[in-house]
Amino acid sequence: EPCVEVVPNITYQCMELNFYKIPDNLPFSTKNLDLSFNPLRHLGSYSFFSFPELQVLDLSRCEIQTIEDGAYQSLSHLSTLILTGNPIQSLALGAFSGLSSLQKLVAVETNLASLENFPIGHLKTLKELNVAHNLIQSFKLPEYFSNLTNLEHLDLSSNKIQSIYCTDLRVLHQMPLLNLSLDLSLNPMNFIQPGAFKEIRLHKLTLRNNFDSLNVMKTCIQGLAGLEVHRLVLGEFRNEGNLEKFDKSALEGLCNLTIEEFRLAYLDYYLDDIIDLFNCLTNVSSFSLVSVTIERVKDFSYNFGWQHLELVNCKFGQFPTLKLKSLKRLTFTSNKGGNAFSEVDLPSLEFLDLSRNGLSFKGCCSQSDFGTTSLKYLDLSFNGVITMSSNFLGLEQLEHLDFQHSNLKQMSEFSVFLSLRNLIYLDISHTHTRVAFNGIFNGLSSLEVLKMAGNSFQENFLPDIFTELRNLTFLDLSQCQLEQLSPTAFNSLSSLQVLNMSHNNFFSLDTFPYKCLNSLQVLDYSLNHIMTSKKQELQHFPSSLAFLNLTQNDFACTCEHQSFLQWIKDQRQLLVEVERMECATPSDKQGMPVLSLNITCQMNK
Amino acid sequence: QKQYWVCNSSDASISYTYCDKMQYPISINVNPCIELKRSKGLLHIFYIPRRDLKQLYFNLYITVNTMNLPKRKEVICRGSDDDYSFCRALKGETVNTTISFSFKGIKFSKGKYKCVVEAISGSPEEMLFCLEFVILHQPNSN
C-alpha cells in the first residue's frame, strides 16, 4: 500500500502500512516523513540515504530495538526526530551522528534508563529533549550537557527520579542555561538536597504529582532554596494519586526562591486561607490558579503585588472580591460558582478576560464596574445575560471588546459604543442582538474589525449602520437572516478588505452596494439562496476583489437567467471552490456545476 | 459490527462498538460497574493513541430511547497545565490511566441509552477514535 502524499514531493504519511523497511519510492525532495506504527525493528547505518532533504521524521511505535552507528547519517537538515514508544535495547554510540541541525528529539517511552549513556552530546543545535515516560533514576545531568548550549526544554516527567543531589546540577553552574524549562512532574520524589538548586537559573520548572505527602512536599520545596525561576508550576493531576492534606506549611519554602510567575495547577483540596498559603508569593508578577476550589473569596482583596492574576477552571462560592492596586491583567475564565458579576476595584487594570463563566451582568459597562480607567482589552464572551445600561463611561481606552455568545440586552436602545473612539476590535457575534437602531455603532471611528454573525435585523433588512466606521477592514454579517440591504449600506467603508455575507437569505445578487469598497479583497456570499441577479445588467465588483465565494447557492440554470450565468463565468478568476457552485433548478440540471453548463438559448416560436 | 462488552451492574448493561474505520484497540474497564441510580467507581483506560492527546475533547451524541439530545462538547485537555496527566501523552505513547467518577440522584427511565463518543485531538484537529456506547437500563424501582 502506498504512502499518502499530503503535500506533493514534500510530506508523506506512511503510518501503519506494515512496512518492514523504509520505503524507497518516495522523492528525494521529501521533507516530512511519518513512518509511525510500522514494524521497522532495526535501523542500519545510512537508513535514510535517499532522504537528503528530510526535516521532520516520525518513527513512533516502529518496534525499533536497535539503532546502529550512523543510522541517521546524511540527514543534515533534520530538525525533528520522534522515537516515541520504541523498545530500544541497543543504541550505538554513533546512533545520532550526522544530525547537525537537530532541534527536537523525542525519546518518550524508549526504555531509556540513564541520561549518562544517551549518545547526544554532539547535538549542539538541540533545543528540546523529551525523555519522559522512561526508566531514568538519576537526575545527574551528564557533562555533555555543557555542549547543549541551545537547550530550552528538558522533559523528564514520568521517570523514576527519587532524589536530587547538589552534584546532579553541577553542569548547569558551569554554563547557566538562562532559558531552560525543566519538567520533573510525576517522578516519585522524596528528597532534594538543600543547595542543589542554589544559584541555578531556570526559565520554567514544573513539579506536579511529585510528592506523596505534605511533609515530603515541604522538605523538597525547601530543597529548592536559592533557585531563580521565571515560572514555577506546582500541583497535581486529577487522575493520579493526590495529597491527603495540604496547608500553608507546604509552600513556606518558596520564600527562599526568586520567582517571577507562579502557577498552581489542579489541587484536590479546598483552599481556604489563601493569604497565609501564598504568603511567600505576594510579590510575584504573575499568579495563576488552575482547577482549584477556593472557599474564601474575600482574600483577593489583600495587598498582593501581582501584576497578572489568572483564575482558570476554578470553583468559587461566589464571585471573588477583587481589590488589587497593582494588577494590570486579570484572566478569569471557565470558572464555576458565583454566577453574578460583582464590581471589582483594579485601578491599574489594562487587560480583562472574563470569558466562559456563565456570568450575568446587571449593568454594563462603565469604569465603576471594574474600578479602572486604563482598560484596553475586555472579553466578556460566552457568558449569560449582559444588560447594556451604560455607554462605557470611563473606559474610553478600550481597543478590544468581545461579547460573542453572551446574551446582550438593550443593545438597540442607544449608542452603546459612543465613547469608544479607540476601539479597534468588536465581536458581538451570536449575542441575540436585534438591530433596530441605526446609531448602534456610532462613535467607533477607529474600528477595524467588526464581527456580528448570528444576530438579526428589523425586517431582515441591513440599513446604513456603518456610516462612521471609516477604518473598518473586516466585517462579518453571516447568519443574520438578511434578505435585503440598503444600496448605500457600505458606502463609507473604503478600507474594507473582507466582507462575509454568507449564510443569509439573499435570493439575488447585486454589485451596486459594493461600488465604493475600493479595498475589498474577499466577498463571501456562500450558503444563501441566490438564484439570479437583482438587475438584468450586473456591473463589475471593485477591481481589488480577489476572492468571491458563491458556493452552495440556489442557482437557476434556465434561459431567462442566461446573462447572469454568463456573468458568473466571466468572474471565473475570482471564484473560489467552483465545484461547489451547482444548479438548483430546473430539476434536470440539479447538481450540475454552474461553470460547466453550456446554455444555448433560442427563441422557440 | 463487533460488540465489546464492558460490564453489567444491578440496573445496567454496558457495551460499545467502534463507529470509525480505524478501530484502533482501546481497553475500557469500569470497577465497580456503573449503576444509573447512583455510582462511584474507577474507569480504567489502556490505549495507544495515533496522535498527540493535546487539546483532546469529546463530542457526545446521546440518544434516549430513539430521542436525540443536542450534541455536547466536553473539553478534556485545554493544551497547557491540564487536569489530567494523559493530556501530555504523545502519539504512540502508552496511555494507562485510572479516572475516578461519581454521580448520584439522577433518575433514569427504563430503556436503551446510546452515546456516541467522538474523540478529537491535536492541531490540526482530527478524530482520534469513535465509540458508540449502549447502556441498557432496567431499574429495579422507579
Epitope: 524507497d24 528525494f28 547505518s45 | -
Partner: nanobody, 117 residues
Framework: EVQLVESGGGLVQPGGSLRLSCAAS????????MGWFRQAPGKEREHVAL????????YYADSVKGRFTISRDNAKNTVYLQMNSLKPEDTAVYYC??????????WGQGTQVTVSS
C-alpha cells in the same frame, strides 16, 4: 553483494573541471539509488548528488547545484559526476554509494579531489 569502483579524482585548479566515474558490479539489479558523497578533513560525510536508477530522478546538494551534474549509463552500470567551476571548498574524498532494496548501503573506496592553485 555490490562492488563499487571510483575513478577520475585528482588535482585541479579553481574554476576547473573533473569527471568522476563509479562502476558497479555484483548484484546490481538490487540497486535502487546511487549517489556521490564527500568527506572533507575533520568534517562529516555529506550528500553531493543522488540518482534513482528506475526513473532517473536526481538530487543535488545546495552547495553544488548548477555546477555538478550526475548521470548514469545503465548499459555500462556506471554513474558519473561531472564537476565544473570547482572551488577550493570542494576539496574532499568523494565516495560513490549504492542503496539496495535490502536495505543496505554499499560504498566505494573513495577518490581524492583537490582544488588548489
Amino acid at each position: 553483494e555490490v562492488q563499487l569502483v571510483e575513478s577520475g579524482g585528482g588535482l585541479v585548479q579553481p574554476g576547473g573541471s573533473l569527471r568522476l566515474s563509479c562502476a558497479a558490479s555484483g548484484s546490481i539489479f538490487s540497486i535502487n539509488d546511487m549517489g556521490w558523497f564527500r568527506q572533507a578533513p575533520g568534517k562529516e560525510r555529506e550528500h553531493v548528488a543522488l540518482i534513482r536508477i528506475k526513473d532517473g530522478s536526481i538530487y543535488y546538494a545546495d552547495s553544488v547545484k548548477g555546477r555538478f551534474t550526475i548521470s548514469r549509463d545503465n548499459a555500462k552500470n556506471t554513474v558519473y559526476l561531472q564537476m565544473n567551476s570547482l572551488k577550493p571548498e570542494d576539496t574532499a574524498v568523494y565516495y560513490c554509494a549504492a542503496k539496495t532494496g535490502t536495505p543496505f548501503v554499499y560504498w566505494g573506496q573513495g577518490t581524492q579531489v583537490t582544488v588548489s592553485s
